[in-house]
């Protein structure tokens, strides 16, 4: 049944579709963008973790307009996937429960079998999601790829595709700042360089506050990493912009250690102002 | 290393004026002072050791009044820009890092009750 | 053997919770959708959920979200269903039943005995 | 959610009539992937219900060949040729097309 007049089962199951998606709910998934290449995924590893693989499989006639040549009922339909160390499966998941198909893993979960349907009838599609742990990707992992075939007891010739990804380590660091006043205001006299003692004489004060926040791990193992501030300190033709009085890191250093920044700010030995002492 | 990308250039180039008296409001130009068109930058770089949640960098600096008295008496408003960044220096090859640098403009204006004082 | 072995009859004060089992026996526990039904007494059926032994994902009906938790053990073969803060509303006969499989089996084709909850203060 | 409206509520029959209920969906019963996902079950007086008949015309293994079912789209029937005394008890239609499931009020089949 479901053969054709030969009574041969010719399947023509495809790989319609197949690609790495982030996982935004237990069954909504969002494609990762891909690489310049349109081939391969970019996954960036900032504390996702697991990382969908959307499968659409169909058993359609390869040509429409001699649909009895294949595309026969595919018995025994299964999808084989072979997973990275780095990638664990964890769970299938369907936008439709009646498209979910029985995915089985051995015991270290890097080899899965997934039933189509027995059997997986002639003019069927389904979609559903790998759900896969990331928990194996280190530092050092630069690429995920994973094995699919597809296979059935019906006559077709089957062979292997590859999804890949390139992993990149985001790092999940953000920044802002504010300055205390926002507006200033210039007046009083023209006086010299030479003639400045204390920092009252210079002009307005100005405090600059830049946050950086680090959500996920600590940064530490993974490079040496630093905070940089441009700071206009002359105009064009070489004269004082904003000049540079004390400059304070608290944080990144370790607990109740303040940081030393370079170069040394108030280059012209300025008093301080005593309300800032 | 994975640090920002030069600041664009501001679309115009003010010269600083070279007269300091008096200009009508409706002369006045809005100028921008931004590294490295407009201004020239000195970068103070911090090291970050032991980074678990937050940094806090603070600066204290001061205008140099001389300078704009001389230089920006005929210009309406001054937009100072002050720019911060993160960089990441790792054997990593693989290391991205988004959001990471920030931009905080001060705009100065010459004091409306200032007497100026040649 | 019985396929899907309820737990007994509970008689639970309003607001304390209820947990019931469904032992399943005789076929592979992940290989089917785990689904409960709630009957109150001369009524008709109400869907509660479903729940998928191989993975737990669950799938409830939105009129349950709040009151129904559908949880297994593949260690023991056994679903569970917890009902929280029950009312008088909630006393009534909950089945486990057995769905399928990969668009085949949307009925439920094994049911356990029925597990009697009475609510009453 | 998709109502089932199921009629009568009571039907009396002799033993060895033919007995019809009838079961009538708020929307199509026809899913996406071609199926029609309307099952038919039997609830005997102090039991649990039991399957009789899947996607709308498959009778379940053991289920004997005076049942029968039909329909389309939103409209089905259950037909019985030859009622018989175990025949006797509580029938649901119900759908699992939509979210969620849903079954029909229940048909009581009883001895006139």
């Known amino acids: 049944q479901g053969c054709g007049q030969d009574k041969i089962c010719q399947s023509n199951l495809q790989l319609e579709r197949y690609q790495f998606c982030s996982r935004i709910s237990d069954t909504e998934f969002q494609a990762l963008p891909m690489d310049l290449d349109g081939r391969t995924a970019l996954f960036a590893l900032s504390g996702q973790p697991f990382i969908g693989l959307e499968l659409t499989v169909t058993n359609l006639p390869s040509d429409p307009s001699r649909p009895q040549a294949d595309g026969d009922d595919a018995h025994e339909a299964q999808l084989l996937v072979t997973l990275p160390a780095s990638l664990r499966y964890s769970g299938v998941r369907a936008l439709d429960s009646v498209e979910k198909p029985l995915c089985l893993s051995n015991d270290s979960a890097s080899h899965v079998e997934c039933e189509l349907g027995n059997p997986m009838k002639r003019g069927a599609q389904v979609t559903f999601y790998l759900i896969l742990s990331t928990s194996g990707i280190t530092i050092e992992t630069t690429e995920l790829e994973v094995k699919l075939l597809l296979a059935t007891i019906s006559e077709q010739e089957l062979d292997p595709v590859s999804v890949r990804a390139h992993v990149f380590i985001e790092l999940p660091l953000s920044i802002s700042g504010v300055a205390t006043p926002q507006q200033l205001f210039f007046s009083g006299e023209v006086k010299g360089e030479s003639a400045m003692r204390s920092e009252r004489e210079l002009g307005r004060k100005v405090k600059y506050e830049v946050t950086v926040s680090n959500q996920g791990q600590s940064l530490n193992t993974l490079g040496s990493a630093n905070l940089n501030i441009m700071w206009p300190h002359e105009i064009a033709n070489g004269k004082w912009l904003l000049y540079p009085m004390r400059v304070e890191l608290e944080g990144g250093q370790g607990p109740g250690k303040r940081g030393i920044c370079s170069p040394r700010p108030n280059i012209l030995q300025l008093d301080v102002d005593s309300r800032d002492r | 290393e994975l640090g920002q990308p030069e600041p664009q250039e501001p679309p115009e180039k003010v010269e600083p004026s070279t007269s300091w008296w008096p200009v009508s409001s409706a002369e006045k130009r809005n100028m921008t002072l931004d590294c490295p068109r407009t201004a020239k930058c000195v970068v103070f770089s911090c090291p970050l050791y032991s980074f678990d949640r937050a940094a806090v960098l603070h600066v204290w600096g001061r205008l140099w009044n001389s300078t704009f008295l001389e230089e920006y008496m005929a210009v309406k408003s001054l937009e100072v820009i002050v720019r911060a960044n993160i960089t990441v220096k790792s054997s990593i090859k693989n290391l991205l890092l988004r959001d990471a640098s920030t931009v905080i403009p001060v705009m100065v204006y010459l004091d409306p009750m200032a007497v100026v004082v040649e | 053997q019985v396929p899907l072995q309820q737990s007994g009859p509970q008689l639970v004060r309003p607001g304390a919770s209820v947990k019931i089992s469904c032992k399943a026996s005789?076929?592979?526990?992940?290989?089917?959708?785990m689904h409960w039904v709630k009957q109150r007494p001369g009524q008709g059926l109400d869907w509660i959920g479903k729940?998928?032994?191989?993975?737990?994902?669950?799938r409830l009906n939105q009129e349950f979200r709040d009151k129904a938790t559908l949880t297994v053990d593949k260690s023991s073969s056994t679903a569970y269903l917890q009902l929280s803060s029950p009312t008088s509303e909630d006393s009534a006969v909950y089945y486990c039943?057995?769905?399928?499989?990969f668009g085949e089996g949307w009925y439920f084709d094994v049911w356990g005995a029925g597990t009697t909850v009475t609510v009453s203060s | 959610d998709v109502v089932m409206t199921q009629i009568p509520l009571s039907l009396p029959v002799s033993l060895g009539d033919q007995a019809s209920i009838s079961c009538r969906s708020s929307?199509?019963?026809?899913?996406?992937?071609?199926?029609?996902?309307l099952h038919w079950y039997l609830q005997k007086p102090g039991q649990s219900p039991k399957l009789l008949i899947y996607?709308?015309?498959n009778r379940f293994s053991g289920v004997p060949d005076r049942f029968s079912g039909s329909g389309s789209g939103t409209d089905f029937t259950l037909k019985i040729s030859r009622v018989e005394a175990e025949d006797l008890g509580v029938y649901f239609c119900?759908?699992?097309?939509?979210?969620?499931?849903?079954f029909g009020g229940g048909t009581k089949l009883e001895i006139k």
């Open positions: 039943a057995r769905g399928g499989y």
């Open positions: 005789g076929y592979s526990f992940t290989r089917y959708w």
């Open positions: 729940i998928d032994p191989s993975d737990s994902e669950t």
């Open positions: 929307q199509s019963l026809v899913h996406r992937n071609g199926n029609t996902y």
């Open positions: 996607k709308v015309s």
């Open positions: 119900s759908q699992s097309t939509h979210v969620p499931w849903t």
